[in-house]
């Protein structure tokens, strides 16, 4: 996922709308001027914001990732969701990359879990249940996953 | 003279919860956005919590979104922040500041509170 | 977040001396900096807002400039009131502080 915090602009384009801050702050899909007097709206499609805030800047939209699936796009509002293609994961202690999941499990474990958009297949030993936290199984046998729906947003 | 005075700091448990006041004097309370920002031990600055000058919208850092709530009495000339499920790592000393007239940042900063999280 | 990399960390500096505290930012934030000056036990206090511009009741001999990525606080003539701890802050998006400079006596 590629992403900077800020949008460029310093000031307001003419076609932005402006409104007044409530209570010193500005709502979601607004950033506030450099003065405090107004609020100026975020850029349908390369900015946003999700909290009342006193921002000077929105927030520059994610752009998905190639290995990545765009499930919806940045709005003023909300900042895109992003997916790992089928077949590929992204962990949370590594976040920057989608990595391929294993076709199968080493022998002696039976898999218990799919691959997932952010889990790889889950194996565990026949007898005893419990984890492999192997990376690459020495033999695998021809046990294939199936890729999960659920969504992730990338931020 | 813009005066903030923090209390209600101490000593508490991981896992507690703690309430800290601010009392502010010397200016229009309810006419200014107001925020805590913490200072941990040896450490730098660290923005916490922000709320608008009517008290009806604030916003967090992720660091202490779901845990942390800012709330203010302007009858009072008071700002609150409770703070839940405490951690080790939340151990500062807490400021609450005033941001200014046309400059959206911090003008006048009381002296703080230490908050110490710890078994 | 945006990172403030604030140099150097300490330095030591006699009254009198010119002192120049520097500022980077990890990306773009405009003029959107301020400085602080802080001492122990005590409330941080503003010295300068929008990169360049006094807050009131702060000595000339503080000046701020600046833009874009890169900032300097400088002190013309330094001051026995002025050993402290300076922290630059950048307001453009949420607040981030750099992790300070102290000024301590030669």
């Known amino acids: 996922i590629t992403q900077q915090d800020l949008a460029p602009q310093q000031r307001a384009a003419p076609q932005q709308k402006r409104s007044s801050p409530s209570e010193g702050l500005c709502p979601p899909g607004h950033h506030i001027s450099e003065d405090g007097r107004d609020c100026i709206s975020c850029k349908y499609g390369q900015d946003y914001s999700t909290h009342w805030n006193d921002l000077l800047f929105c927030l520059r939209c994610t752009r998905c990732d190639s290995g990545e699936v765009e499930l919806s796009p940045c709005t003023t509002t909300r900042n895109t969701v992003c997916q790992c293609e089928e077949g590929t994961f992204r962990e949370e202690d590594s976040p920057e990359m989608c990595r391929k999941c294993r076709t199968g499990c080493p022998r002696g474990m039976v898999k218990v879990g799919d691959c997932t958009p952010w889990s790889d297949i889950e194996c565990v030993h026949k007898e005893s249940g419990t984890k492999h936290s192997g990376e690459v199984p020495a033999v695998e046998e021809t046990v294939t996953s199936s890729p999960g729906t659920p969504a992730s947003p990338c931020s | 003279e813009v005066m903030l005075v923090e209390s209600g700091g101490g000593l508490v448990q991981p896992g507690g919860s703690l309430r800290l006041s601010c009392a502010a004097s010397g200016f229009t309370f309810s006419s200014y956005v107001m925020s805590w920002v913490r200072q941990a031990p040896g450490k730098g600055l660290e923005w916490v919590a922000t709320?608008?000058?009517?008290?009806?919208?604030?916003y967090y850092p992720d660091s202490v979104k779901g845990r942390f709530t800012i709330s203010r009495d302007n009858a009072k000339n008071t700002l609150y922040l409770q703070m839940n499920s405490l951690r080790a790592e939340d151990t500062a000393v807490y400021y609450c500041?005033?941001?200014?007239?046309?400059?959206?940042?911090?003008?006048?900063w009381g002296q703080g509170t230490l908050v110490t999280v710890s078994s | 977040d945006i990172v403030m990399t604030q140099s150097p960390s300490s330095l030591s500096a006699s009254v009198g001396d010119r002192v120049t505290i520097t500022c980077k930012a990890s990306?773009?934030?405009?003029?959107?900096v301020a400085w602080y000056q802080q001492k122990p036990g005590k409330a941080p206090k503003l010295l300068i807002y929008?990169?360049?511009t006094r807050h009131t009741g702060v000595p000339s001999r503080f000046s701020g400039s600046g833009s874009g990525t890169d900032f300097t606080l400088t002190i013309s003539s330094l001051q026995p009131e002025d050993f402290a701890t300076y922290y630059c802050q950048q307001y453009s998006s949420y607040r981030t502080f750099g992790q300070g400079t102290k000024v301590e006596i030669k």
């Open positions: 929008w990169a360049s």
């Open positions: 990306q773009d934030v405009g003029t959107a």
């Open positions: 709320i608008s000058s009517g008290g009806s919208y604030t």
């Open positions: 500041a005033r941001r200014g007239d046309s400059m959206i940042t911090t003008d006048y």
